[in-house]
């Protein structure tokens, strides 16, 4: 076709951004391009072209009119992880092509098993008590909070400090006795550790 004066090659005007999304959830990788004639958009993951509903009507990935890639649900198995990877969109017309910046799609995860469950502790009143916990593996890395007798502990209380996976109670009182649970949390949800009993005895 003959070059028309008003035609111009594609340029990406909206680049995709990195995203972390939970398995089974929908998400979108944005891409918008300008050009005349209007460029076609294709997506590539880890260097390989991504199939969408344009290739297979049953696909869980849809190429939107804007050029964005919409995932009906993020698919992520024990082994096969077809949606996780590094994506680029490529806009093409007869005058050339434009490639977006890389965008990573990572799948959030939170395993069930705690790396370290807290264990029972026995202390004398007035002594410090330390309960330790390491949350399950996860992405993003899980944070933790603690519950006593199923109620979240107020971390602002002056005798309580939480650093890393350690709950430290200084100058313990009889009222501190009870069942303590460590809770690991990230965007996927929450996981409760096995409970540990804190026993406080009078000297």
């Amino acid at each position: 076709s003959r070059l028309r004066q008003e035609d111009f090659p594609p340029r990406i005007v909206e680049h995709p951004s990195d995203v972390i999304v939970s398995k089974g959830e929908p998400t979108t990788l944005n891409c918008k391009a300008e050009g005349r004639p209007t460029p076609t958009i294709e997506w590539y993951k880890d260097g390989e072209r991504v199939e969408t509903d344009k290739d297979d009507p049953r696909s869980h990935r849809m190429l939107l009119p804007s050029g964005s890639l919409f995932f009906l649900r993020i698919v992520h198995g024990r082994r096969s992880k077809p949606d996780e990877g590094t994506y680029v969109c490529v806009a093409r017309n007869y005058l050339g092509e434009a490639v977006s910046r890389n965008a990573s799609l990572e799948v959030a995860l939170l395993r069930d098993d705690f790396r370290q469950n807290p264990t029972d502790v026995v202390v004398a009143a007035g002594e410090p008590a330390i309960l330790e916990c390491q949350p399950p593996r996860g992405h993003p890395e899980p944070t933790i909070y603690w519950k006593k007798d199923k109620v979240r502990i107020d971390e602002k209380e002056e005798r309580i400090s939480i650093r890393g996976g350690k709950l430290m109670i200084s100058n313990t009182r009889k009222s501190d006795a009870g069942m303590y649970t460590c809770v690991g949390t990230n965007m996927v949800g929450e996981r409760d550790s096995d409970p540990a009993e804190l026993t406080v005895f009078e000297r």
Partner: antibody
Framework: EVQLVQSGAEVKKPGASVKVSCKAS????????MHWVRQAPGQGLEWMGW????????EFPQKFQGRVTMTRDTSITTAYMDLSRLRSDDTAVYYC???????????WGQGTMVTVSS | DIVMTQSPSSLSASVGDRVTITCRAS??????LNWYQQKPGKAPKLLIY???SLQSGVPSRFSGSGSGTDFTLTISSLQPEDFATYYC???????FGGGTKVEIK
């Protein structure tokens, strides 16, 4: 259309090797693990191992370790299964199968009959 | 290794019958259990994944249930095209059950 197309039937002598190919099309080849499953005449399904096309990592059950090799060529979206030191009880139909993100074998090749006979 | 035990190994049934096939794992596999149908000379076909999820395009007369070690595949009303061999598979270590052949009574 998502499909797996396997190479044709083979007749081999005991002690020889066989290499079966599995050409994938219609999907992102590197996103899904590829498995090999065999079925001896009149018998059930036996899992032989997997390959991750993204990095070439493989895993096999103890029974096949040292005798099976799985490779892939991402440029032509093809997986290969090589079985060495063939015996008569290796006579079977060999299938490649894609593992979905739901942890199941959702797409299967048509099967390749391998006959081991002296 | 996780061993999958299917029962019965074969059964005879008539069109319209309700058919139940069971699969037992030698240790807990949570819901990592799939069911396949295979007809003579054909590759297996996925029916149910994750113990109870129906694969796209599979008739709703097929259903799966169970978790842990005990699982069931049910065909609510057997159709002529359902006479085949059915396999369970655990997707932790990937082994298959021995199969159940459903024959015409």
């Amino acid at each position: 259309e998502v499909q797996l197309v396997q190479s044709g039937a083979e007749v081999k002598k005991p002690g020889a090797s066989v290499k079966v190919s599995c050409k994938a099309s219609g999907y992102t080849f590197t996103g899904y693990y590829m498995h090999w499953v065999r079925q001896a005449p009149g018998q059930g399904l036996e899992w032989m191992g997997w390959i991750n096309p993204k990095d070439g990592d493989t895993e096999f059950p103890q029974k096949f370790q040292g005798r099976v090799t799985m490779t892939r060529d991402t440029s032509i979206t093809t997986a290969y299964m090589d079985l060495s030191r063939l015996r008569s009880d290796d006579t079977a139909v060999y299938y490649c199968a894609r593992e979905s993100g739901d942890d199941a074998f959702d797409i299967w090749g048509q099967g390749t009959m391998v006959t081991v006979s002296s | 290794d996780i061993v999958m035990t299917q029962s019965p190994s074969s059964l005879s049934a008539s069109v319209g019958d309700r058919v139940t096939i069971t699969c037992r794992a030698s240790q807990s596999i949570s819901s990592y259990l799939n069911w396949y149908q295979q007809k003579p000379g054909k590759a297996p076909k996925l029916l149910i994944y994750a113990a109870s999820s129906l694969q796209s395009g599979v008739p709703s007369r097929f259903s799966g249930s169970g978790s842990g070690t005990d699982f069931t595949l049910t065909i609510s009303s057997l159709q002529p095209e359902d006479f085949a061999t059915y396999y369970c598979q655990q997707s932790v270590g990937l082994s298959f059950g021995g199969g159940t052949k459903v024959e015409i009574k």
